[in-house]
């Protein structure tokens, strides 16, 4: 999944004006305001990586 | 395996300094924020510091702003909490935690995952 | 700084029973709520992040859910190692501030 331009979620990121551009391996992570290490998921029934979908079933990917 | 490990507490009087290490294993701390948390007896969780050693951001709690100071040592793959001006109400078991993040549409969605054994610091004359 | 405020602060419950925790926020902070289980004399451990995501292991027996300011930590059936203390943390904007705890225990 390539890198994607985000949405900060909180007018209180010290960047909240400046969307963050984050790598293939990273997210953005508003606690730090930075991007950050980001894994990937995979659903228990097919196995299939995937980004984290809001109101999906998932798991975290096991020993990654 | 990842593992978290503390080390450092112990018994100060008030107005001294400890330095709490947390030493990581199984990943690289540079990829990761890293926490300290805190737990007085009896008590619940509290929140104290956390660094994020690629960039060198931290960020305190108010409760110990300017006499705690967080670290890390990439090339030890180690975190550190250098603590002064130590009070009674400090005394408490100190935790360590990595804080996970997972890709949701770009944007970490995560807890602290892996936290260290904790390590007691007490504070008393 | 955002104050998570859980509910109840203790409760008392048997084994098989539905057990319901809440935790309100001072703002809004989106789904970015996690969920920990602690027991005497150990570390934390990770339940639910982003208000309802299942972490690694955790039985399926732990639910959670809400958004903006309201979350809900829901055990289906309680089971005896389920006795111990819950807190919500959320992670929205620093500082990451802790709820202040609910501690299950046996009715």
């Known amino acids: 999944m390539g890198a994607r331009r985000l949405r900060v979620r909180s007018q209180r990121s010290r960047d909240s004006s400046v969307p963050t551009q984050c790598n293939q391996t990273e997210c953005f992570d508003p606690l730090v305001r930075n991007c950050v290490s980001c894994e990937l998921f995979h659903t228990p029934d097919t196995g299939h990586t995937s980004s984290l979908e809001p109101g999906t079933a998932l798991q975290p990917q096991e020993g990654s | 395996e990842v593992q978290l490990v503390e080390s450092g507490g112990g018994l100060v009087q008030p107005g001294g300094s400890l330095r709490l290490s947390c030493a990581a294993s199984?990943?690289?701390?540079?990829?990761?924020?890293i926490h300290w948390v805190r737990q007085a007896p009896g008590k619940g969780l509290e929140w104290v510091a956390w660094?994020?050693?690629?960039?060198?951001?931290?960020d305190y709690a108010d409760s110990v702003k300017g006499r705690f100071t967080i670290s890390a040592d990439t090339s030890k793959n180690t975190a550190y909490l250098q603590m002064n001006s130590l009070r009674a109400e400090d005394t408490a078991v100190y935790y360590c935690?990595?804080?996970?993040?997972?890709?949701?549409?770009?944007?970490?969605?995560?807890?602290?995952?892996?936290w260290g054994q904790g390590t007691l610091v007490t504070v008393s004359s | 700084d955002i104050q998570m405020t859980q509910s109840p602060s203790s409760l008392s419950a048997s084994v098989g029973d539905r057990v319901t925790i809440t935790c309100r926020a001072s703002?809004?902070?989106?789904?970015?709520v996690a969920w920990y289980q602690q027991k005497p004399g150990k570390a934390p451990k990770l339940l639910i992040f982003a208000a309802s995501f299942l972490y690694s292991g955790v039985p399926s027996r732990f639910s959670g859910s809400g958004s903006g300011t309201d979350f809900t930590l829901t055990i289906s059936s309680l089971q005896p190692e389920d006795f111990a203390t819950y807190y919500c943390q959320q992670s929205e904007v620093s500082p990451p501030t802790f709820g202040q705890g609910t501690k299950v225990e046996i009715k």
């Open positions: 199984g990943f690289t701390i540079s990829s990761s924020s």
């Open positions: 660094v994020l050693p690629s960039v060198g951001f931290t």
């Open positions: 703002e809004e902070i989106a789904t970015a």
């Open positions: 935690a990595r804080r996970v993040c997972y890709n949701r549409l770009g944007v970490c969605a995560g807890g602290m995952d892996y």
